[in-house]
Every structure is written in C-alpha cells, then in structure tokens.
C-alpha cells in the first residue's frame, strides 16, 4: 500500500483555485525526491502537469504551484483560474509518475449558479444555523410574511406568519418579526441538512404590491481535514462545534459504508469495543469543544471520522459536524511492542515503552487507563520520581534501555492490575502507546520471604531463590525508592533446596544488611536482568524494630508467611507534598496532566477526561 | 506436549555460516517469545539472541550483535537463527527455548521449555 496520502475528492466552481496537500513519510529520501502532480489519461498513463524540479506545463503556466515542505512530510499544489476542462483524475507522486508512490485524487470543477439578480447568498455549514433577511415596505407592514422554497418550477411553502410550518422543517424553523421600527422580517432555520439547499423567496403580502426577495442557501457539507498518523502511534481530533451546543452530547463516529457513522465514543458513555483501553474523550470546554485521543493506531482504524453534537449522541440529520479523513502510514517510526503483557499472581511484568528518541530529556509517564465516563488515565508513575501512594515499593519507572525505549516494572501482582496501561512523555504526543496486562494462573519464579522484621545495629540477611532456568542472567537485589530502585551488594550463597527437578544452577542470593538502621525500614527488591532488560522482580517489606535481644537475623521463607501487601508504614512514613505539574502539551496541548497533591484530601495525578477527583496520597 | 527440536549445527571454518532451526509444537498459543541460549563446556549458560512471536521484534547479544540474524517463519512454527562470520569463540551448544507467557522482554524472559541442543564448532 502506498504511504502517499492526501484528498480523495476535491470540489470547486469554475473562476476559483483549490489548493491540495499531499502527505509522505518524512525519511531523508523522500524529503528530496521529485514531488509531481499528474493528470492521469484514458489508457493509464500520468501526465505531468508540475513537478518540484520546476518543471510546470503550459496548460499550467501562470496559474499554479508545487511546494514542498520536507520538515512536515507534506507537499502543496496550488492551482487557480480553474475552468470545467481542470475536472478530472489526477496523482500526486513522489519520484517517477510510474512508480507506485502515488495518490489518486478526483477534481471536480462546476459552474457557478445561475442566479437571478437581487438574489443574497448564504454559505453554512452542515447542521448549523442561517438567517434569512427579508425586507418590507410600511404598507405590507400588517401583511402576511411568509417564505417559499423553489422545488422545481414551484414555489413550495415554508413557513409563514400565520404559524404554518412545512413538516420537513418541524422544530427547526421559526419567523421573528422585528419590532415596528425595522421594516424587516426574519426566518431562522436550525440543524441545516444538506436538503435545505437551494433557492427561497420571501414575501410580504400576497397581491401585486407584495415585497419579494430572493435568497440562494448554499449546505456546505464538511471538507475533511486530513490525518496522517504513523500505525501503532496516537492521533487527537479536535471538535470545536460551537458554543450552541455547549450542552448537547457530543459523539465520534467513524463512516462504514454509506452514511451509516459508528459511534466511536460519546458523552453518553458509549464506547465501541475495538477502541477499547485506547481512546479518551477529552471534557469539553464552556464553548461545547472537546477533543478525542486515540492510541495504538490500527491499519482499520484509516478512515473518515465525524464529530458532531445530538441529543442521541450519534450522527442525525441536521447534527453539526467536523470531519477528518484519517491515514494510518504503516511505514512507520514508532516500533512495534508487545500490545498484551501476561502476569501471574503475586509476581511481576516488565513492559517495554517506546518514546521518540529525539526526545531522550523528556519526562516519560505511566498511567492506567479507566473507561468509566468518558475515559481518563489517571497517572501511576514517572520519570521525574513520582509514584503513586497505592503503588509505593511495586512500581518503577527506569530510563533503561535508553535509545528511545524506558522500562515499567510493577510486581506483587493481583488480579486489579489487570488493564489497560498507556505509556507516554511531555514530548511528542503522537508517541502514546497502550498496552494490556492480563492476570493468568501461575507461580512466581521467584521465592522471598513475605515481609522480614530488622533489628536496630544487628546484621539482617534476607534470601531470595532462583530456578535453575534463570541460570544465564544476572541476578541483583536492589532498594526501590521513588526514582528507582538502587542495587545492592548481595551474596551467591550456591544452589537453591527450594526447587523440586532443579539441577545445580538454581541459586540462593541474599542480601545483607550490616548494622541496621532506621534508614534501612522500607522496600527491596530481588530479581534477573539481561544487559538493559529487567525480568522477573519480587519484593521484600523490612521494617526495623527496636533491638530486643542480641544477635543477627537470617530469615528463612519458612518464616515468610505474612502476604505481599500487608505493609504497615509508620504514620509519618512519606510526607506528602502540596505540588502541582501541569504540562498542557501531555494531552493535546490541553488539560493534560493535573497532579496536584494536597495534604488533606491526598492527590491527583490523571492524564484526564473526568472530572471525578483521584484520592490517595503520593510519594515524591 | 511442547516439543523444541533444533537443528543445523556442525563443525565450520572461522569466517564460515551456519543457520540454525527450532522447530516448536504443542504451543497452544501465539505470542510465546523464542530465545536462543548457548554454552560451552565448562562455562555458564548465555544467552544468544530471542525473538517475540507477539510483535516481531528481535534482540541480540553484544557478542554477536551485527553477525547474527533470528527471524520467525509463523506458519511452519519455526525460528531460524543465521549465523555469519562464525569465530572460534562460538563453539558451544546451541539451545533454543520458548517463553511461554511473555511477562518481560525476551532477552530477560521465563523460559520453561527448552531443546537439547545442537552442537556448533567452529575451527580456526
């Protein structure tokens, strides 16, 4: 399939110019290759008209340009003076006409109407409001107004004084006559369809002395703004439809064949199941916008999407819209990861985030994504040393491997973490990416002790047992803290008894405290790594009591009886901070992440589409 | 019953190829990563090269990075593992194995099943 993108159909009138982009992956050989606009002939050749090696045609002398903006991945032909003769098909290429690299695009250029003198135009959009001016003299003053639509040879009525009303514009339509100074009446009609347009006569009486006015109404169905989106990257829809429907649901539907429009989402809580754990509908603003992010773009999810605003929350006749034509280049930058991470119970996952490597400074986020609503994602971890309180001592954020990809660990899994996660920076917003951790059934690889109690000055040593099948990697014990998790020297104490049909190679690894402080009370971790990569990790809670008798401790996993999560923290064991980030460009330049924490009611932290607060505290 | 039977080693001269294959079955599943473990007598077990079977992205060690090639051939269930300008430091047995879940990145993965191994020897 070719990555070239740009207009389907593009439509004028005779006397005016068009102006036509045309999408191509950025790499540094397209951004210098010879970008062409052809028209292509009866017997499937193209012949071209302008070419960026400056090459233009005299059938195009004087009346258009091609310009290539290589920083965008885009390239412009502008063409003026069109006449009915510029209908046709044509291509915009990169490299030679023959090659493949090309777009199809339809112009059709139409006359322009024929319109009977006196006659006033109005241009609106689809599913918007017009008002139509009709002037009167004093003596038609008392007179019935009313207003007429040309079908065919014949007027049809409309609407008039007398409270008629034509059934195809029930409850959009009403006549205002202003006040007895101004010698006018007005027909204000709402939710425009596209049959509305066409030609109306409003008049003021019903004998020879009648005031008659002509007014041509001209539907402008949507042209859509064209996407191009890198597959497995995130693309957001901006809708700003205006503040009349500030408080009318609002939906995205994406066209299937016909006019049928699937909803995608609305602000009534639909949500189609393929968008799953990777959309978001941002809250919109006073003036009725909002916007939709979608994640881990899929080849199906190409296509025409349409915003609109509808008491049912899905496209109706007379609904205003915007439109977008949505192109998803497989050619992509964003690498391919791992859509789905598996975990068992009571052990961990590590999951592999992309970011643009461009971007190796920016603050990297994690943040699990709750449909509930419109969707949000409130935030669990970042690079700058936030975690979230609920998942202090189980989740890190690590900058390895580095080169554009970071590292998430959460273990002591339970069946709540299942979910979808998102991965994302302040950097480039098109590099947002999902991923699902399922809960299945299974035994951790590795065994630790539940928690271990330490004694203030003595030496505690904490095991931890690894099977012989992670005999190649390395293995470490490390403190975790907000921003990380600091390695420790530990101790190869020889092969492991804790497995049944495990040869020599399994191994026995302790950590050792010396002289155990208050500062040592908190979370450790042990667990295998390869180079840059983390497996399997199992955490260990040691809280430090006063020294009750002599000697140093060795806990053994006969004593590790108490469960994962049962920490008891001191009252005062993280403070937290009353500190706020806000980055707008985290979630399309708006809105984007609100952490702000405070002492009483705990934190936020939500790349957000809600307004339901996040309680619980924080560790900074 | 999960079975991984490699196959393609021999004895080969320094600067020679050799492409080995690892031919998986009983996996009632298809995002299982494959990796590629080697060890030469009286050394520890190392890790080689793997592949994700979810996403196709492959890995490699330092030691080999640039020489090695594993690609995946989904339809006869079988990963290849191309070896190119061979070294004598090579010599090993060469195991493939299967993680089977996918909690982590292949190279760091929980390999529970494993082959028994070809034997690669490379002479000076």
């Known amino acids: 399939k070719s990555p070239i993108f740009g207009p389907e159909e593009v439509n004028s009138v005779e006397g005016n110019s068009v102006s036509i982009t045309c999408y191509y992956p950025p790499t540094s050989v397209n951004r210098h290759t010879r970008k062409y606009w052809c028209r292509q002939g009866a017997r499937g050749g193209c012949i071209t008209l302008i070419s960026s090696e400056g090459y233009v045609s005299s059938k195009y002398a004087g009346r258009a340009n091609l310009t290539n903006f290589p920083e965008n991945g885009t390239f412009v032909v502008n063409i003026a003076q069109l006449s009915q003769d510029d209908s046709g098909r044509y291509k915009c290429g990169l490299g030679i006409n023959s090659r493949g690299l090309s777009f199809d695009v339809s112009l059709e250029v139409s006359q322009g109407p024929g319109l009977l003198n006196d006659t006033k135009v109005y241009t609106v959009d689809l599913g918007r409001t017009v008002t139509i001016n009709c002037p009167f003299k004093t003596e038609n003053a008392q007179k019935r107004k009313s207003l007429y639509k040309q079908i065919g040879l014949y007027p049809v009525l409309v609407i008039d004084s007398s409270g008629y009303v034509n059934p195809n514009y029930t409850g959009r339509i009403r006549l205002d006559i202003q006040g007895t100074g101004q010698l006018l009446f007005s027909v204000v009609i709402n939710q425009l369809r596209l049959s509305d347009a066409g030609q109306y006569l409003c008049q003021a009486g019903d004998d020879s002395n009648s005031n008659k006015k002509n007014a041509d109404l001209q539907v402008l169905k949507p042209e859509p703004e064209l996407v191009y989106e890198d597959l497995r990257g995130s693309v957001t829809f901006h809708c700003a439809l205006g503040p009349e429907v500030a408080n009318v649901a609002k939906f995205l539907c994406r066209q299937s064949s016909g006019e049928n429009c699937d909803v995608v989402v609305n602000t009534l809580g639909k949500r189609a199941p393929a968008f799953e754990g990777r959309i978001l509908l941002n809250p919109q603003d006073k003036d009725g916008s909002f916007s939709v992010v979608i994640t881990g773009l899929r080849k199906e999810d190409a296509g025409r999407y349409l915003c609109g605003a509808h008491s049912d929350g899905q496209l109706q006749e007379g609904s205003p819209i915007q439109a977008w034509q949505l192109f998803v280049n497989e050619e992509s930058t964003i690498p391919r990861s791992p859509t789905v991470v598996k975990g068992v119970a009571g052990g961990s996952v590590a999951v592999l985030c992309p970011y643009n490597r461009k971007e190796s400074k920016s603050i990297k986020y994690w943040c699990l994504w709750e449909g509930a609503q419109n969707g949000r994602c409130p935030l669990l971890v970042d690079s700058e040393g936030w975690v979230k309180a609920q998942y202090e001592g189980r989740l890190s954020l690590l900058e390895e491997p580095g080169n554009g990809t970071f590292t998430v660990i959460l273990n002591q899994l339970t069946s709540r973490d299942a979910g979808f996660y998102w991965c994302l920076t302040n950097g480039d917003t098109l590099w947002r990416t999902t991923v699902e951790i399922k809960i299945i059934e299974g035994e951790p690889n590795l065994k630790v002790p539940g928690n271990v109690t330490a004694v203030l000055g003595e030496t505690l040593k904490v095991p931890c047992h690894f099977p012989c099948k992670f005999s190649s990697y390395e293995k470490y014990w490390c403190k975790w803290n907000n921003t990380g998790c600091q390695a420790l020297p530990s101790q190869d104490e020889g092969p492991s008894k804790a497995f049944v049909n495990c040869d020599e190679n399994s191994r026995l690894v302790s950590l050792t405290l010396n002289l155990v402080t208050r500062a040592d009370e908190g979370w450790y971790w042990c667990g295998v790594k390869q180079g840059h990569f983390y497996g399997e990790t199992a955490a260990v809670y040691v809280a430090v009591e006063e020294r009750k008798a002599a000697g140093s401790r060795d806990v053994s996993l006969a004593k590790a009886d108490a469960a994962p999560d049962e920490k008891v923290l001191d009252s005062g064991f993280r403070e937290i901070e009353n500190k706020a980030i806000q980055d707008p460009r985290l979630f399309a330049e708006e809105k984007a992440v609100a952490d702000t924490r405070d002492q009483a009611d705990g934190s936020r932290a939500s790349v957000d589409s809600g307004s339901s607060e996040e309680q619980g505290g924080s560790s900074r | 019953e999960v079975q991984l039977v490699e196959s393609g080693g021999g004895l080969v001269q320094a600067g020679g190829s050799l492409r080995l294959s690892c031919a998986a079955s009983?996996?009632?599943?298809?995002?299982?990563?494959i990796g590629w473990f080697r060890q030469a007598p009286g050394k520890e077990r190392e890790w080689v090269s793997c592949?994700?079977?979810?996403?196709?992205?492959?890995y490699y060690a330092d030691s080999v990075k640039g020489r090695f090639t594993i690609s995946s051939d989904n339809a006869k269930n079988t990963v290849y593992l191309q070896m190119n300008s061979l070294k004598p430091e090579d010599t090993a047995v060469y195991h493939c194995?299967?993680?089977?879940?996918?909690?982590?990145?292949?190279?760091?993965?929980?390999?529970?099943?494993w082959g028994q191994g070809t034997q690669v020897t490379v002479s000076s």
């Open positions: 194995a299967a993680d089977a879940i996918g909690s982590f990145p292949c190279p760091a993965g929980v390999y529970d099943y």
């Open positions: 009983g996996f009632t599943f298809d995002d299982y990563a």
């Open positions: 592949i994700s079977r979810s996403d196709g992205s492959t």
